[in-house]
């Protein structure tokens, strides 16, 4: 199934998307939808670029903050609510036959967690978990197959982003 | 709400070019979604043939490619299907049909080629 | 092409019955996978999406299922306006391939 990224409401949500431009600047129309992506196109767009910039946005909580221009497309969800919670498309509109690349991303929204962490379990969940976690200031994610990710359960995640919050994180599971 | 209607000539005969028009009402078609035909064959197969995008951009079924070509009038909110030196193998019902998953279909066009 | 094998060509059934049509692609689609009915001398329609994701409007009496390679449409309760023809579509790679249909009558 999709890969899952988990983010707090109230804070960033980061989803990772990237092509690589061939050649170097030859950037391609790409489009973020709501919703597992359909046949064509994007479902209830929430942001499209065409080959030079952004230029469709439905709300100013949709970002793309990463270097756009070499390809990292990776949307960034201002300020989540619980009704930001679902499957997200973000489709790489390559010309040719057909060649668009598609890839749906989860994310689930999660209220704030009310345990207080111990003050050393961020340093030794990141240290055991070390992909999980993307923020809005990364590039994309190193590309994974969704059963490459460390088992982690969901007390583990809900007192993970308790530790987060202020940093705007987003975690990523299978 | 999105609507489209097919028209055709209903018969053709062998080798000459078949022109399909689609008709699209309560949506521009440079606004959005892949403007689309289909076929569906007698024995009810259906076939996608081709589609052109609301920027213009087409792209063709392979096993059609040297055959077909899909065009639109934007200023009478029209798309066109061209199949050059038919066979009595297209004979078939044509659909024109939009939408992300194509949610919207016109009521199809049945086409025979007969000499 | 990505070959849809969809079974059975037909099948009949009853009124209340649960029935069960499948879609096997020559290889993996990833789930891009959607179910479309069609009644007599009516273009398709759009059922579902994404294996699961039911097109609006549709009763929850349809369900999708699977992955990998194969799929299936369940239909529980059978009503009489459910007799018609089904199609499954991949929209893994182009160009689209149809399954060769699956029509349901009434037994």
């Known amino acids: 199934s999709e890969v899952e990224y988990i983010a707090e409401v109230g804070q960033n949500a980061y989803l990772p998307c990237s092509y690589t431009p061939a050649p170097p600047g030859n950037l391609v129309p790409v489009c973020w939808g709501k919703g597992a992506c359909p046949v064509f196109d994007c479902s209830n767009v929430v942001l499209r670029t065409d080959n030079r910039d952004v230029n469709d946005r439905t709300s100013g909580r949709y970002w793309l903050k990463g270097d756009f221009h070499k390809g990292d497309v990776s949307l960034t969800i201002e300020n989540v609510t619980l009704a930001d919670s679902g499957v997200y498309c973000c489709r790489i509109q390559i010309p040719g036959i057909m060649n668009d690349e598609k890839h749906n991303v989860k994310l689930v929204v999660i209220k704030p967690a009310k345990v207080t962490p111990a003050p050393t379990l961020q340093r030794d969940l990141t240290s055991a978990f070390p992909r999980m976690l993307t923020t809005g200031e990364h590039g994309p994610a190193e590309t994974q197959t969704p059963g490459s990710l460390p088992d982690v359960n969901l007390t583990q995640i809900f007192t993970l982003t308790n530790e987060l919050r202020d940093s705007g994180a987003t975690i990523r599971t299978a | 709400d999105v609507q489209l209607q097919e028209s055709g000539p209903g018969l053709v005969k062998p080798s000459q070019s078949l022109s399909l028009t689609c008709t699209v009402t309560?949506?521009?078609?440079?606004?959005?979604?892949?403007w689309n035909w289909i076929r569906q064959f007698p024995g009810n197969k259906l076939e996608w043939m081709g589609y052109i995008n609301y920027s213009g951009r087409t792209s063709y079924n392979p096993s059609l490619k040297s055959r077909i070509s899909i065009t639109r009038d934007t200023s009478k909110n029209q798309f066109f299907l061209q199949l050059n030196s038919v066979t009595t193998e297209d004979t078939a019902t044509y659909y024109c049909t939009s939408g992300g998953n194509f949610d919207y279909w016109g009521q199809g066009t049945t086409l025979t080629v007969s000499s | 092409d990505i070959v849809m094998t969809q079974s059975p060509s037909s099948m009949s059934a009853s009124l209340g019955d649960r029935i069960t049509i499948t879609c096997q692609a020559t290889?993996?689609?990833?789930?891009?996978l959607n179910w479309y009915q069609q009644k007599p001398g009516k273009p398709p329609s759009f059922l579902i999406h994404?294996?699961?994701e039911l097109a609006e409007g549709v009763p929850s009496r349809f369900s999708g299922s699977g992955s990998g390679s194969d799929y299936s449409l369940t239909i529980s309760n059978l009503e009489s306006e459910d007799f018609a023809d089904y199609y499954c579509l991949q929209f893994y790679e182009f160009p689209l391939t149809f399954g060769a249909g699956t029509k349901l009558e009434l037994k």
């Open positions: 309560g949506y521009s078609i440079t606004s959005d979604y892949a």
């Open positions: 290889q993996d689609i990833v789930k891009n």
């Open positions: 994404y294996v699961t």
